[in-house]
Amino acid sequence: IPTEIPTSALVKETLALLSTHRTLLIANETLRIPVPVHKNHQLCTEEIFQGIGTLESQTVQGGTVERLFKNLSLIKKYIDGQKKKCGEERRRVNQFLDYLQEFLGVMNTEWIIES
Amino acid sequence: IPTEIPTSALVKETLALLSTHRTLLIANETLRIPVPVHKNHQLCTEEIFQGIGTLESQTVQGGTVERLFKNLSLIKKYIDGQKKKCGEERRRVNQFLDYLQEFLGVMNTEWIIES
């Protein structure tokens, strides 16, 4: 990811910029953007970044608001890179089963599951 | 999700079945399946279930191993439903920003981020 700062620092800075520019961003009161119904955020990265694209096109650019959208673009690049890493390594069945067990374990303990 | 038991119970049962049938499942020592490199599992659901499909096609069916793959199929249906819910509600910008802030907050605190 082509950025001088680590992704974790980038996320922190983006949170601060989002807070700073909130008033400017909500100026368009008629615009509609998809908001996921649940809190399993990682399942919705595509829609989240589509929403960011819509918001960017409707926001007057300049100053640090540009920095906010640049950061969000870098975060998208990082996530796209992570998605590529889902299928790059083909390994033995026992290693796949370890990962599947871990996935189901996380789903069991951390996901917000509605019946 | 068309199942008589809640998804949370389904996940628990699947974990138990996975443990029970592990020896049978790893019998094919030549089979190679994509295993994600990182622990942000939700980003990799597509690859995980493709891997399950590959494994199922290579496994002799019958008894409770069939139940395992049926459960995994129901879990996939649940996740597909959750993915649909990412874009069904198109709301005002302020509600989108709340979700974006929450997403970045979770990314900041819970994701396993490599620089």
Epitope: E29, T30, L31, R32, I33, P34, V35, V37, E47, F49, Q50, G51, I52, G53, T54, L55, E56, S57, E114 | K85, G87, E88, E89, R90, R91, R92, Q95
Partner: antibody, heavy 115, light 113 residues
Amino acid sequence: QVQLRQSGPGLVQPSQSLSITCTVSGFSLTSYGVHWVRQSPGKGLEWLGVIWSGGSTDYNAVFMSRLSISKDSSKSQVFFKMNSLQTDDTAIYYCARNRYVLDYWGQGTSVTVSS
Amino acid sequence: DIVMTQSPSSLSVSAGERVTMRCKSSQSLLTSGDQKNHLAWYQQKPGQPPKLLIYGASTRESGVPDRFTGSGSGTDFTLTITSVQAEDLAVYYCQNDHSFPLTFGAGTKLELK
């Protein structure tokens, strides 16, 4: 199957309020939003407002000051209340489920405002 | 508010004919983020609520016959019925699903010749 059933009065006195209940089946109000739309010969179809799956609301600015939408998800009921009705509020009032757009509609409640 | 203008206001047709009705919006209904046109079409028969036919300008709702086709982008949209059946006689409404408030056209009434 998905159904929305409406109940409410047919006749309302001028300056009084209108209350309609929309009872849904075949889906959960924690997963889907519900819109309210009215239809009159003079003004055609008019969108009034929506209550989202999470409980937040959005209203048409024209009706905001006298409209309230709430719900009891455990009873699968959505409540619509409009204050200070005048003769030009005579219309058929509909509730409709949100899934991207308004995919299922109630049968409608015909409301006449007259003394 | 986005104004939706439908034309014609009524159409007289014979069974089996191809029918085209138009809907024009006062602002573009194309969203840059998802590159989708947020427009829906509904059919309403007398004494019934509207029924969803098309959303996203061209996506047919499940169970809707394939003789109904939605097309268009930006501000100009079309609903085509390739071979009109007797049960298609109704009023057809387009709806802006792009921005709040959601707004509807005045309708196109499909009548039998």
